[in-house]
Every structure is written in C-alpha cells, then in structure tokens.
Interface confidence: low
C-alpha cells in the first residue's frame, strides 16, 4: 500500500483538523520548551505544504518521509541550541537516526511550571474569543508535559474539553458546571498518560514480544469468545499502532487506530458481544470506547486446560514446533478463563510454564517432569492475592491520606536514595490504589490493583532512569517487566544507606502554609515525612506518628494565630527540637 506522497496520504485519510492536531502534538512532544506560537507557526507551514502535496503528489519534496519532513521542520527552530543543548546535535544526523535522537531526548519530567487554572470567566472569554487557539493551547500544554501521551486519545480529550466549555460557558452557574468536568479530564488525562507510558516502556525497553504478550493476555480477558487467530490479529494490529505512537509516528498511529476500530466494528460477531454500543459512536469516541470496553462473558463450556497443556503427550512436540505460538495459545487460554487475575500475574504464569517446558522437554521423562506444573502456579497466584487483601485492609483501616503515609514510609525505607519529590509523587499515587480498587468485588480487585501498581511503578522507573541513584531501583526496573511489582514488594529496609544529616531548613515552615489547598498541605506534610525517614530510617511507626501528629497540631495552631508568621517563627524551632528528641 505505497503512496507517492506519504504526507498527502495521511492528510487525506485524517482530514485537516486531525492532521493539524496530531502534528501539533508531535512537535510539542519533541520540543517541550518551545513557545506555543512557534509550534503553531511550524504546524501551519507543514499543513500548507501538505495541501500542496494533496493537489499534486509529484510536487517537490512531497515524496519525502514524514520523519524527514517533520525533522527538517523542527531543525529550523532558531533557538534549538540555546534551549535544548545537545538535542541540537540530532539535526546533524540523517534519518532514521535523527528521529531516534529526538525520541531519546524526550523528557518525562520537563522543567515546566504547573498549569494554573484561571478564573472560569477568564477561560470562557478566551474560549469564545478564539475557540481554535484555545483548543490548540490545550493540546500543546498537555503534550509538552506528557511526551508519550497517546496522541489519538489526546484528540478525544480535546474534543471533551471543547464540549465542556461549549456547554458550561452558557450555564447559569459556569463554575459549578465546568470545574468538576475539568477535574475529571485532568485526572483521567494523568491516568491515560501513565498507562500509555507503560506501553511505550514495554515496547522500548523489553521489545515487541513483551508488549504482544501483554496484549494477548489483556485482549483474551476482554474477548474470551474470540478465537486465538482473531486475538492474534488484533494483537498484531494493536502492537503496530502503539509502536508507531511510541516512536513519534503519530499520523500513522492515528490512521492505523482508526482502521483497527473499523475492523473491530465490522467483525463484532467474532470478537465480542460488548462492542455494539461503541460502534455507533463517532471515530474518536468509538476508539476510546473500544479500548475501555468491559470484558465479555466467558463461554460456558471451556474445557480444562490440563488436557492440552499438561496431560497431553504432545506438549513438548507442540512446544518445539512453534514455541511462541504454543506459549501464546497457552496465555490466551489461561487469560480468557481468568478475568479475575491481573495481566502481570498471567504473564508470570506463562513465564513459569515456559521455564518448566524448557527444563522438562530436555529431561529423560518430560511428562513426569511437567506433570505438576499447575501446582507450581499456586504460590504465584497467592502472592498478589494476599498483597491485595492486606493492603485493602490497611486502606480501609487508615483512609487514603494515612494509607499514603504508610506507603511513603515503606518505600522511603526500601529506596531512600530516590529524590523526595519522586517518592512523594509515586507513594501518593500508589496510595490511590485503595480508593480505586478496594471497593470493587473480589473478582475485580487483583486486576485493578496490580495492573494499576505496574503503571505507577513504571513512573518511578522512568524518572529514576533519568537520574539513577539506586542500584535496587535499577535492578527492579530492568530485570523483568512482569516481576517489577513483586521485586519492589520484596525490597527490605536498605541497611547500607547512610542516614541523611538533619537539616533544620527542611523542617522550617511559614505562614504561606495556611493558604495552601488541602492537597498542597498534604504534599508539604508528606515531604517532611519522607525527609524524617531519610534522617532516621529505623524510626518506628509510633515515633513517626508522634512527630506527624505534633506537626499537624503545630500547623493548625499557627494557622489559627493572629500573627501567623510570628507563630511559625517561634513554634517551628520548638517542633524541630521536640521531633529530634522523639526520634533520638
């Protein structure tokens, strides 16, 4: 399916609006520090060029690859060297090395100010004054902060953002209408970004085999009535889509995602009974709906797995004939029977099965050797089950904030070398697993919890890769994708860690503390808690609880005082002295 002009092909397939949106996202994800106006100018130039190619595919430069066209455009930015330093060296390279170079310079933690939400009236005026610019600004601001955000999904978020303003800016109480919608979009957006980041890490760090295994397991849970061949086809197509998006090929990715949605809707009968309501929706909504669709009901008459994968005398023959196909079929069969397992657990079981076959198929009596393979699965299954049970009990006992604090202490003791902001961010997100998953019925708890934890721990891994400080973190992040969570769970107090010297400045607070939102106050307190544990890693729960209770009382007292700043200045040193004494 070759085209004389790739840029014309994608422009025609996607339409001008989506084309421009995707190019803006691509450029913003590559050059994260560039001003909005600069990106808009580049996008307009690319769009005008694309239109000339649509008119005449033989026109000059229309035959160039998208990487060449986009890379050439990015390399025209005048301030590239000053703003991005060594990233400017990418421009000296030829494709495909140049694009790889740009990809390697994507920054997961860009030094950008947090997005401040203006007053509702200000936002509504901006929306009405220039809707197109307002929405482009949204794409730009999200994309530059989340350089791996799933681009076609970001277009869906932008459409919802537009709909929220269109509806709420006409409402009697604009704020009451708009703010909950914006909060929901923000939270869903962060979750979507983190989920996609794990997909890209899986592809980039562990290869497409790892991603395909994940996809086989997940799609088999979602579509248990589909044949293996059908699941394999979907996995192949989905892998292509995500490989493209993670590689910066956003136009191809969006185009192929639309093709996949079309295929799924045309073949619902052989995939799932749950797709119908998705397939009536417009493209962006349809693709989102298909990605989030609930698991179909399991066929009633599924035979035992043991017959084909344990009892059969042909196990080793079948395995030897086509290892990946045989393991893929095992994973498919196991996953479609176990929507109650996390994908990561299913992958561990497949890995254990593969290891057993590798060992047993070389043994004198292979059948005797692998006869008990399913028994070996039991401890692998029980470990996450117990973990979810214990942590949900703790969450129910403590509530979210204190549960986060328990995790902060736990993870700071495990990996105290990690920066305090990273420990706070990651532990707060780990703590959100409680509210997200513990209220679910038993059969949905483990897939919810463990697969969510995999996403959060991936964030720790990508941040740590940027500035590695802990061999333990590197080991857990790089050795095995499926065993990351058990690896972190198994870490104990780091005995080799030299406690951080006490710094009174870290525990000095001012009156501005009183004007912070509840969330910001929590982050301040949790930052102090991490610093305490770094100073006294062997402090007991009781000691830390005592100090944190004193801290809360001290802040509350000073925030009620007439002269708040004077109170902080006077009570602060007392709190520090009392804390040191309590932890001595």
């Amino acid at each position: 399916d070759t085209h004389k002009s790739e840029v014309a092909h994608r422009f025609k397939d996607l339409g001008e609006e989506h084309f421009k949106g995707l190019v803006l996202v691509a450029f913003s994800q590559y050059l994260q520090q560039c001003p909005f106006e600069e990106h808009v100018k580049l996008v307009n130039e690319v769009t005008e060029f694309a239109k000339t190619c649509v008119a005449d595919e033989s026109a000059e430069n229309c035959d160039k690859s998208l990487h060449t066209l986009f890379g050439d455009k990015l390399c025209t930015v005048a301030t590239l060297r000053e703003t991005y330093g060594e990233m400017a060296d990418c421009c000296a390279k030829q494709e495909p090395e140049r694009n790889e170079c740009f990809l390697q310079h994507k920054d997961d933690n860009p030094n950008l100010p947090p997005l401040v939400r203006p007053e509702v009236d200000v936002m509504c005026t901006a929306f009405h004054d220039n809707e197109a610019t307002f929405l482009k600004k949204y794409l730009y601001e999200v994309a530059r902060r989340h350089p791996y955000f799933y681009a076609p999904e970001l277009l869906f978020f932008a459409a919802r953002y537009k709909a929220a303003f269109a509806e709420c800016c006409q409402a009697a109480d604009k704020a009451a209408c708009l703010l909950p919608k914006l909060d929901e979009l923000r939270d869903e957006g962060k979750a979507s970004s983190a989920k996609q980041r794990l997909k890209c890490a899986s592809l980039q760090k562990f290869g497409d085999r790892a991603f395909k295994a994940w996809a086989v397991a997940r799609l088999s849970q979602k579509f248990p009535k589909a044949e293996f061949a059908e699941v394999s086809k979907l996995v192949t197509d989905l892998t292509k889509v995500h490989t493209e998006c993670c590689h910066g090929d956003l136009l191809e990715c969006a185009d192929d995602r639309a093709d996949l949605a079309k295929y799924m809707c045309e073949n619902q009968d052989s995939i799932s009974s749950k797709l119908k309501e998705c397939c009536d929706k417009p493209l962006l909504e349809k693709s989102h709906c298909l990605a989030e669709v609930e698991n179909d009901e399991m066929p009633a008459d599924l035979p035992s797995l043991a017959a084909d994968y344990v009892e059969s005398k042909d196990v080793c023959k079948n395995y030897a004939e086509a290892k990946d196909v045989f393991l893929g079929m095992f994973l498919y069969e196991y996953a479609r029977r176990h929507p109650d397992y996390s994908v990561m657990l299913l992958l561990r079981l497949a890995k254990a099965y593969e290891a057993t076959l590798e060992k047993c198929c070389a043994a004198a009596d292979p059948h005797e050797c692998y006869a008990k393979v399913f028994d070996e699965f039991q401890p692998l299954v029980e470990e996450p089950q117990n973990l979810v049970k214990q942590n949900c009990e703790l969450f129910e006992q403590l509530g979210e904030y204190k549960f986060q604090n328990a995790l902060l202490v736990r993870y700071t003791k495990k990996v105290p070398q990690v920066s305090t902001p990273t420990l706070v961010e990651v532990s707060r997100n780990l703590g959100k697993v409680g509210a997200k998953c513990c209220k679910l019925p038993e059969a949905k708890r483990m897939p919810c919890a463990e697969d969510y934890l995999s996403v959060v721990l991936n964030r720790l891994c990508v941040l740590h890769e940027k500035t590695p400080v802990s061999e333990k973190v590197t080991k857990c992040c790089t050795e095995s994708l499926v065993n990351r969570r058990p690896c972190f769970s198994a870490l104990e107090l780091d005995e080799a860690y030299v406690p951080k010297a006490f710094n009174a400045e870290t525990f000095t607070f001012h009156a501005d503390m009183c004007t912070l939102s509840e969330k910001e106050k929590q982050v301040k307190k949790q930052t102090a808690l991490v610093e305490l544990v770094k100073h006294k890693p062997k402090a007991t729960k009781e000691q830390l609880k005592g100090v944190m209770d004193n801290f809360a009382a001290f802040v509350e007292k000073c925030c009620k005082a007439d002269d708040k700043e004077a109170c902080f200045a006077e009570e602060g040193p007392k709190f520090v002295a009392a804390s040191q004494a309590a932890l001595a």
Partner: nanobody
Framework: QVQLVESGGGLVQPGGSLRLSCAAS????????MSWVRQAPGKGPEWVSA????????RYAESVKGRFTISRDNAKKTLYLQMNSLKPEDTAVYYC????????VGQGTQVTVSS
C-alpha cells in the same frame, strides 16, 4: 497446523551466492519474529540470524555478519536468507524457525559449498 517449508538450497562454489526461502502457514506469520538455523553434519543446530515481526530489527551470528542478509515479506508469509561470499564451513542443512527457537519444524534445505 504450523508448517514451514524451506527451499533454495543447492551446490555452490566458494564465493558464490544463494537465496533461501521459507514459506509459512498455520499461524499468524506477521505476529512472530523468525530465525534461520543451520545444522552441519555431525554437529548440533547453530542459530544463524533473526528478524523481528515487522522486519525492522535484524540480528546475525558473528560467523555470517556482513555476508548474510535476513528479510521477510509478511504479505507473502515468506522468510528469506540471502547468502553471499559463501565458504565451505557454511555447508549445512538450513531451516527456519519461529522466534529464536532452534527446534526444527520443516525438513530444511541442503546448502553445500565446495569447489
């Protein structure tokens, strides 16, 4: 049923070239990485080269680097091995496999390099 049928082998003089083909059926060929493996008389199987499912990533054993090129055509469900500058020590039965497996599925194709 997974089937892999190799062809293109033969007798060739040192320094000559051959192009091997492997026709696949019975599985979603485009979903899997593929390899070429060879087995010389009286020796165990030796992995020669591998290619990922999309064809973008290729790997070679040191002994064949720079002389052999692996490729695939997913539409035709066919794997290829272009062998140039052949040496007597390349003499073996060549067979294709799924993934990095060295387990034989097809019959293989005999390559003999001799003057």
């Amino acid at each position: 049923q997974v089937q892999l049928v190799e062809s293109g082998g033969g007798l060739v003089q040192p320094g000559g070239s051959l192009r091997l083909s492997c026709a696949a059926s019975g599985f979603t060929f485009g979903s899997f990485g593929m390899s070429w493996v060879r087995q010389a008389p009286g020796k165990g199987p030796e992995w020669v080269s591998a290619i990922d499912s999309g064809g973008g990533d290729t790997r070679y054993a040191e002994s064949v680097k720079g002389r052999f090129t692996i490729s695939r055509d997913n539409a035709k469900k066919t794997l290829y091995l272009q062998m140039n500058s052949l040496k007597p020590e390349d003499t073996a039965v060549y067979y294709c496999t799924i993934g990095r497996s060295t387990s034989r599925v097809g019959q293989g194709t005999q390559v003999t390099v001799s003057s």
